[in-house]
């Protein structure tokens, strides 16, 4: 039986049940390399409290549909008096990066995971030439996730004192230049994740090979190597390579530019101080507030919730968007869709789509940007579920009693972008981390 998601086959993936201190290792095409789980385990559970290992999914006992992968075992379990077998169930949804398997819940018999990934899309529009896992768990099982830094189009410029060259990088995947008609970036070879431009020539100096690694609690490392044979004439016989070290800052700060810290014979060392390198709980919340010792900030957007059936309205030329954030009030146009953002076609108001649901909410504050994300909306033709990204700006003089109003700024591949100036986005910092 052919592997259902070949792009995900090259790696052993990890997921964590934080509540129970359990680490899962997942290999969807073969078996994980953990002796304690046996030779054919596809999903291996490591209980860190009891220091025990169990296989909860066997690679031989795999069944697959387009959106669901199940691994059974021969181990019996008792579920409400009936004799079942322990199994793992992975639900796949279309995403814009390779993504990460997320632990959802576990019963006595079934371990449930969800995975938003390019591998599950109906069309190839989000697929990279080359992409590697872009997250890692530290020794305390805290997740560090650089997926938000991955550029689907374009690149980051590395700060370098050399005026004659420009070094461009992407994070965990190759640089897509197809949407840029005229810049230097267009000359970069396909597949490169680190592109060096000298004059009118562009060179591949690194492609992703291995996933993100953690070297210390707040330092993550990504390594790119040039796969192609044949040395570059300016590298003195060496093969080019790029090492990017992502550093979680010691306190809250604005984002910084990736900086070249060393360069020798086409070996480039880059340091990037970014809060995305910090553990995810430091940056994100499933509610509309971020506060407490863990986050170093106090943010509360809950006053933006609308009551009594009213919604914020944002004009998107062809569409009207109705938004009701930080609550669970149904938007009238999007009745029974559980939408936080509802898209209505002006020319035909019967065409209504959920552009993100209120129970699929993430508030993120990282590198000085405050963003509220709603995902899991109605599917587009690619299979990607519509989502909305609201970028907040602090404005102490915002209208509407300080609440302000969301402004639609554009759409890319079924992701809808808004900006929102409001006094409730003014962040209060506590200075310790």
């Amino acid at each position: 039986q052919a592997a259902p998601f070949p792009e995900l086959c090259s790696y052993t993936w990890e997921a964590v049940d934080t509540k129970n201190n359990v680490l899962y290792k997942i290999n969807i095409c073969g078996s994980v390399d953990i002796v304690q789980c046996g030779p054919s385990s596809a999903v291996c559970e490591h209980d860190l409290k009891t220091r025990t290992y169990h296989s909860v999914g066997d690679s031989v006992l795999r069944s697959a549909t387009r959106s669901l992968l199940e691994f059974n075992t021969t181990v019996s379990c008792d579920q409400q008096g009936t004799n079942h077998r322990v199994q793992s169930s992975i639900a796949f949804l279309c995403g814009k990066t390779l993504g990460t398997p997320e632990f959802v819940t576990a019963t006595e018999c079934v371990h449930y995971f969800e995975w938003r990934t390019t591998a599950a899309c109906k069309k190839d529009i989000f697929k990279a030439n080359k992409e590697v896992p872009c997250y890692v768990f530290d020794e305390e099982l805290r997740k560090h996730d650089l997926n938000p830094l991955i550029k689907l189009s374009g690149a980051y410029l590395v700060d370098d004192s050399d005026p004659d060259t420009s070094l461009f990088i992407n994070v965990c995947r190759d640089i897509d230049t197809l949407r840029d008609p005229g810049s230097q970036l267009r000359a970069c070879p396909p597949g490169t994740a680190a592109c060096l431009v000298r004059g009118h020539q562009a060179f591949d100096v690194g492609q992703p090979r291995d996933g993100l690694k953690v070297v210390r609690k707040d330092r993550l490392v990504l390594s790119y190597v040039r796969e192609e044979a044949g040395k570059l004439d300016f590298c003195d016989g060496h093969s080019p390579a790029v090492t990017i070290t992502f550093v979680c800052p010691s306190e809250r700060r604005e984002g910084t530019i990736p900086k070249l810290t060393a360069k020798s014979n086409c070996r480039y060392e880059i340091e990037w101080i970014t809060e995305y390198a910090c553990h995810r709980d430091y940056l994100e919340s499933k509610t509309c507030s971020l506060s407490g010792e863990q986050q170093d900030v106090s943010i509360d957007l809950t006053p933006l919730a609308q009551s009594g059936g009213s919604s914020y309205i944002s004009d998107g030329k062809e569409y009207l968007f109705y938004l009701n954030v930080c609550g669970e009030t149904e938007i009238q146009f999007c009745n029974k869709k559980q939408a936080a953002v509802c898209q209505v076609k002006k020319s035909d108001t019967s065409q209504v789509k959920a552009a993100g649901r209120y129970h699929n909410q993430t508030l993120r504050y990282s590198d000085g940007d405050l963003t509220l994300i709603y995902f899991g909306g109605d599917e587009c033709s690619s299979g990607f579920q519509r989502m909305s990204v609201i970028n907040f700006e602090c404005n102490k003089t915002a209208g509407n009693d300080g609440k302000g109003t969301p402004v639609f700024t554009g759409e890319v591949d079924c992701t809808y972008f808004f900006t929102w100036d409001t006094e409730y986005a003014c962040v209060h910092h506590h200075h310790h981390h």
Epitope: L157, S183, F417
Partner: nanobody, 123 residues
Framework: DVQLVESGGGLVQPGGSLRLSCAAS????????WGWFRQAPGKEREFVAA????????SYADSVKGRFTISRDNAKNTIYLQMNSLRPEDTAVYYC????????????????WGQGTLVTVSS
Amino acid sequence: DVQLVESGGGLVQPGGSLRLSCAASGRTFNTYNWGWFRQAPGKEREFVAAIRWSSSKTSYADSVKGRFTISRDNAKNTIYLQMNSLRPEDTAVYYCAASIVDFTTNPSHFGSWGQGTLVTVSS
């Protein structure tokens, strides 16, 4: 691709003000950086200011810091350059540009350009 059209240039006295506008059309969200550049006669094109579309993060050339302000109106897909305390050395053709490269001020990293609008500062 992104199409950019500048307006608002003209003749102004030293110490005066002007506001340039740049209207963007096309798939504007595929570009992350919006910049203003200028080119004086016989000189290289130089960076003036930049802003990211998805947030209000800005950067400025040292020569215009404190005098010029870049801003955007997302509802109108328009980028502005408010120029105060203008000096004769600010005389140039001002260009609006868009880039898919983050953190850059280098004109060669900007792939889409407007036609430019002339600003003359003279008494």
